[in-house]
Interface confidence: low
């Protein structure tokens, strides 16, 4: 089942990335280098989707920058296929599933003076299920409330205060949000959750609720990158990968992240009896992408050089802000109860060979199905 996931894995976008750009991991590294001691959390698939949507209305070099920045090689597939691929993906992700909450969406808030092209609005709605809203940015408090209320409603109150402030000179604000909460295939026993130390650095300790469960997990030790990787399946298709770098090796692991590395991990997984200790946490990341994407070559769209003629007839519009917020909650809930003792006995030999894996220092996490839904670093649960 894990092998199947490898074959189906699309990293960041549904079109094969060209070798020039590893969008997901380049974006991760850009966020990590901007704030080395901060936690990071974002949704590559969600950001790729909103950029692809934006490319619908972009022309000439602006469009080229977006698609190249995403690492998309459109000689291999047409633009139409790209958008259709995202349409299909969005439909799959938004399907209601037992024990699986996912709210993902895009919206465009445009100044009252901006007339949007009907073709763009209709393509946006059809392909990306995205909404557009005329907004009075002169009343920045009112505009901010309108945007935050919309996202809070779409995520059933899980994402509030998407925007903390707003420039009254804004013309187009693009909002991209994703919230995820799923049940593990096998739950962690609540009784096994205890307060334990988490080393934010080797000098800064915080107490965290640490979940624990002994079970068979997909596991590997990557000697090249000096880290241990464990896969914990959710109900349905998704799997969480938790990566624990050896002490002092976080940067080495971050530098080694790539589509190739992820595929290798998923291929090399072996079932192993583990006593897994994992913090219970909720993590969120909120990013002003207009500040980060230029370092990945996507800059025109945020400047006066933007060609967004497909969005509006106004010759001088640009995207003022592109805001992305991703939220995930990790707790004990599973669709199947864990054994009451928190231990599943197989053979005596397996029990004796059980290895203890304690996530008590900064670690990385992926949530993958056929795409990388989320990628993050937990520096402080």
């Amino acid at each position: 089942e894990m092998k199947k996931r490898v074959e189906d894995l699309h990293v960041g976008a549904t079109v094969a990335p060209s070798s020039r750009r590893d969008f997901t991991f380049d974006l991760y590294r850009a966020l990590a280098s901007a704030a080395p001691s901060q936690s990071i959390f974002f949704s590559p698939v969600s950001i790729s989707m909103s950029l692809a949507m934006l490319s619908l209305g972009a022309g000439s070099s602006t469009k080229m920058q977006i698609l190249e920045g995403l690492g998309l090689n459109l000689q291999k597939s047409s633009e139409k296929e790209l958008h259709r691929g995202f349409q299909q993906l969005l439909q799959e992700l938004n399907q209601p599933r037992d024990g699986f909450q996912l709210s993902l969406g895009n919206a465009l808030f445009t100044d009252l003076v901006v007339d949007l092209q009907d073709t763009f609005v209709s393509a946006m709605k059809t392909l990306y299920l995205a909404d557009t809203f005329p907004t009075n940015f002169r009343d920045s408090a009112g505009a901010m409330k309108q945007i935050n209320d919309y996202v809070a409603k779409q995520t059933k109150g899980k994402i509030v205060d998407l925007l903390k402030n707003l420039d009254s000179n804004a013309v187009v604000i693009m909002v991209n949000y994703i919230f995820f909460k799923a049940k593990w295939e096998t739950s962690f026993n609540h009784k096994g959750t205890q307060e334990q130390d988490f080393y934010v650095t080797s000098e800064t300790v915080v107490r965290v609720p640490m979940m624990s469960r002994e079970d068979q997990y997909h596991y590997l030790l990557d000697r090249n990158l000096s880290c241990r990787v464990v896969g914990v399946p959710y109900q349905g298709n998704a799997t969480a990968l938790f990566i624990l770098p050896s002490e002092g090796k976080m940067q080495q692991v971050e530098n080694g992240l790539s589509e190739k590395t992820l595929r290798k991990w998923l291929k090399m997984f072996k079932k192993r009896q583990l006593e897994l200790y994992l913090p219970k946490f909720s993590i969120e990341g909120s990013y002003q992408l207009e500040k980060v994407l230029p370092s990945l070559g996507i800059s025109n769209v945020f400047t006066s050089h933007a060609d967004l003629s497909g969005i509006s007839n106004h010759s001088n519009i640009q995207v003022s802000e592109m805001v992305h917020k991703a939220v995930v909650e990790v707790d004990e809930s599973g669709t199947r109860a864990a054994a009451a003792t928190g231990t599943i006995f197989t053979f005596r030999s397996a029990r004796l060979n059980s290895q203890r894996l304690v996530f008590n220092r900064p670690f990385l996490m992926f949530i993958v199905d056929n795409n990388i839904l989320f990628l993050g670093k937990v520096n402080r649960p």
Partner: antibody
Amino acid sequence: EVQLQQSGAELVRPGALVKLSCKASGFNIKDYYIHWVKQRPEQGLEWIGRIDLEKGNIIYDPKFQGKDNITADTSSNTAYLQLSSLTSEDTAVYYCARGGYDVPSFAYWGQGTLVTVSA
Amino acid sequence: QIVLTQSPAIMSASPGEKVTITCSASSSVSYMHWFQQKPGTSPKLWIYSTSNLASGVPARFSGSGSGTSYSLTISRMEAEDAATYYCQQRSSYPFTFGSGTKLEIK
């Protein structure tokens, strides 16, 4: 290569003030903690305190608070320890060490500076 | 503040002998770290986070313990192991060191 280069030995009069330096190379001090540790002749190690430039905070062992002053200058990538109102009790070797993210703390130490307080 | 008490203060061991140095904390700590120091040199990180050997430390060294009781063990003493060993806690400020154990070769 990570290195901490400390200033040379000091011979000072009681009551005087001395400022020791610890110049870092191979890393940016803003991204790490810099600790100072005291070792009196034939005695053990005593932690004085540490500076965290990223968050702009300094923590001292209460017994050194007010007496010792830790500062740093990011432009020269150097941390400083200033000792005031010196007495014979301050005669010691003072070490700086790197702490903080990623590589285990205290894995890198300066070579130490001997301060001798004598009339 | 947390007081660390090391014992013995001084000891000597023959080559090949097993050596154990203990460090007792006045209140519970999460991890213990150990340093080796030889005369006229800076201390060296020897064992970190209770049981991890620092880079270049021979495998005959090991560390263990939890709560208030920790130890450093040398499975077979060698001449180059003669030095002073200090334990250190970083679970709460101010960080503190033990008073040291001077290990000599017989």
